[in-house]
């Protein structure tokens, strides 16, 4: 967190608190998380440490769910203290506030190994796709606090961290929505998210990431009671994430191909596509689901993965050279990722210094492209569109300040790949 | 410390050859760029180029690409820049000049002390 | 190649006085712009660089401004060190130019 002047306040989850202020942090998908304790230090920093829980004498304790720790049954506070929560509505059925349940059909871009785990939180339910552990054995069951089956004597205290762990301010709540768009899935080894594991419906305690754990990425997508999707648009009956893109379908015209339509949080932006004016060819020609004329038998340089026609257009879209240069001495790594246009003709880099897995250092630089000519080490790593550029930056503004005050190992190698287009199916992009 | 030393003056004839040496040390030499500066007297600095140390590519200016030679010698940590067919106008202060690690974009963190070339008849 | 012109080419002014140099490129170099300081006989020294960074173990007083086309320095409060000539240097394309230089003398 940046101090702010002279009247020194923190900044979480864009709300202000003054110094030495206390409070449990609200982390999506798990809601008010009553087993961590924030303090605004002096210096404008934000300190979360894990609540210790004493030891508990008898032998039934009661988990009472707006407090950490487990009580005895004759220490409870009465029941006029009783915080009472919302409860939540979705398909038909209502959840209790804590309570986690399974939800189908969210995220179109769900891999086999991964479930979409959905809590209810003061009245919000929020859900995220959570990416399951490989499985050891051959008959797994299922457990109330995951969408993940386990198998037998798994999953109970290895979600649990140890106590009193001190972590940094975790990223503001969009910084876990955004760069894991619908056009990739890390693969389940990283660990992309803000967040691993759902903890128990009962207990809050092991909600926060710890580096060293395997587990999956967490993106979230928050819905109402109203079934509205936070950060999906629907056209047509199609669910779309945000930053996807799509060609209308018009009821009157079937699919067009020449509007081209993006999901931006939860409005729907279409933007009309326009062809070139002048083709490196005498006769191009018109070809059923491509919107512009492409040149005949004349294929561009591919690259793994990508199409791209004559001009280097992908989905309508221009597309920009993306080159990426790893630099690394002396524990630190400077990771350089530039774009370069034509209008106007010249590079931008991105520069990224990570030391022990610790942002130090980052800012953008425009140099010419004759200046970028001069330097070594960049080398092609793909080709983009201007509208995955802003989804890379935008994620990459999120995670510059969530990766200067925690551990982050491959979120910045995992957002390079919002850049990677995807070979467009035949007809539709 | 990061220093840059470099040879001492030296006094040249129309026509010859001069080349200027500048040690690095406190850092890896191999790891950022050396540049060459010059200053005429009363003047104002001019960049000659640039030599990668790691591999000993160059970038020269346009106005001296034909008349400088830089090169490097890992082993000594040691980076050179030669100008030949000296003329009059050539009698300049040379630096070299380091340019920081995490920007693309040039900025000489640290100098050479100068060495001063004159030529004259 | 890109011009560099900086204003005034000398100043005269006193300890304690805030001093401004401008300088002005002749096309838009974004933040690819640096300012040193030179003392005679000695090496330039960098102050700023990407317009408006401080390099590291320069006083604060020193600070830069400004994006595109006009940038300026700034010396809140002149100190008797600080009388010497400054540079203003386009790093945002190759051949690598610099101002003329301003003379700042005291008053």
């Known amino acids: 967190e940046q101090v702010k002047h002279s009247e020194t306040y923190c900044m979480f989850q864009d709300k202000k608190y003054r110094v030495g202020e206390r409070w449990h942090p609200y982390l999506e998908p798990y809601g008010l998380v009553y087993c961590v304790n924030c303090i605004c230090s002096e210096n404008g920093n934000v300190l979360c440490s894990r609540v210790r829980c004493p030891n508990v004498h008898c032998l039934s304790p009661v988990h009472i769910p707006h407090l950490c720790c487990p009580r005895c049954p004759d220490s409870l506070p009465p029941v006029n203290n009783k915080v009472t929560s919302k409860s939540c509505e979705y398909n038909g059925t209502t959840y209790q506030h804590g309570e986690l349940f399974v939800a189908e059909g969210l995220f179109q871009n769900r891999q086999p190994n991964q479930c979409t785990q959905c809590s209810c939180s003061e009245g919000n339910v929020y859900c995220g796709l959570k990416t399951c552990p490989k499985l050891t054995c051959a008959f797994p069951v299922s457990v109330p606090d995951s969408c993940c089956r386990v198998c037998r004597g798994d999953g109970e205290l290895s979600w649990e961290h140890s106590d009193g762990d001190i972590f940094r301010q975790p990223a503001n709540r969009e910084a876990r929505h955004s760069y894991h768009r619908s056009h990739y899935d890390p693969p389940p080894s990283r660990q992309a998210g803000g967040l691993s594991r759902f903890p128990g419906a009962r207990s809050h305690r092991g909600a926060l990431m710890d580096s060293q754990q395997a587990s999956g990425t967490i993106v979230q997508i928050v819905i109402n009671n109203k079934h509205k999707h936070g950060q999906v648009c629907v056209s047509n009956g199609k669910t779309y994430s945000h930053g996807e893109s799509w060609h209308p379908n018009l009821r009157a015209f079937g699919i067009v191909e020449c509007v081209l339509c993006t999901c931006n949080v939860t409005k729907q932006e279409c933007k009309k596509i326009h062809c070139p004016n002048r083709y490196p060819c005498k006769y191009p020609q018109k070809i059923d689901g491509k919107c512009c004329k492409v040149c005949p038998g004349k294929k561009a340089k591919e690259l793994p993965g990508q199409s791209f026609d004559n001009k280097g257009y992908f989905c309508g879209e221009e597309t920009m050279p993306v080159y990426e240069s790893v630099f690394m001495e002396d524990g630190e790594t400077t990771r350089k990722i530039a774009l370069e246009t034509e209008r106007p003709p010249q590079v931008e880099v991105h520069v990224w210094t990570i030391r022990k897995g610790i942002l130090q250092h980052f800012h953008i630089e425009k140099i010419s492209k004759r200046m970028f000519e001069e330097l070594p080490h960049f080398k092609l790593v793909t080709r983009t569109t201007l509208s995955q550029w802003k989804i890379f930056t935008e994620g990459e503004a999120q995670i510059s300040q969530m990766c200067s005050s925690r551990v982050c190992r491959t979120e910045l190698e995992d957002l390079v790949k919002v850049l990677y287009l995807e070979r467009s199916e035949k007809g539709h992009c | 410390q990061v220093q840059l030393v470099q040879s001492g003056a030296e006094v040249k004839k129309p026509g010859a050859s001069v080349k200027v040496s500048c040690k690095a040390s406190?850092?890896?030499?191999?790891?950022?760029?050396m540049h060459w500066v010059r200053q005429a007297p009363g003047q104002g600095l001019e960049r000659m180029g640039n030599?990668?140390?790691?591999?000993?590519?160059?970038n020269y200016n346009e106005k001296f690409k034909s008349r400088v030679t830089m090169t490097v010698d890992k082993s000594s940590s040691t980076a050179y820049m030669e100008l030949s067919s000296l003329r009059s106008e050539d009698t300049a202060v040379y630096y070299c000049a380091r340019s920081k690690n995490n920007y693309v974009a040039y900025y000489f963190d640290y100098w050479g002390q100068g060495t001063l070339v004159t030529v004259s008849s | 190649d890109i011009q560099m012109t900086q204003s005034p080419s000398s100043l005269s002014a006193s300890v304690g006085d805030r001093v401004t140099i401008t300088c002005r490129a002749s096309?838009?170099?974004?933040?690819?712009l640096a300012w040193y300081q030179q003392k005679p006989g000695k090496a330039p020294k960098l102050l700023i660089y990407?317009?408006?960074s401080l390099e590291d173990g320069v006083p604060s007083r020193f600070s830069g401004s400004g994006s595109g086309t006009d940038f300026t320095l700034t010396i809140s409060s002149l100190q008797p060190e600080d009388f010497a000539t400054y540079y203003c240097?386009?790093?945002?394309?190759?051949?690598?130019?610099f101002g003329q230089g301003t003379k700042l003398e005291i008053k």
């Open positions: 990407n317009a408006n």
């Open positions: 096309e838009n170099i974004y933040y690819s």
């Open positions: 406190g850092y890896t030499f191999t790891s950022y760029w």
């Open positions: 240097k386009q790093a945002y394309d190759v051949p690598l130019t």
């Open positions: 030599i990668n140390p790691s591999n000993g590519g160059t």
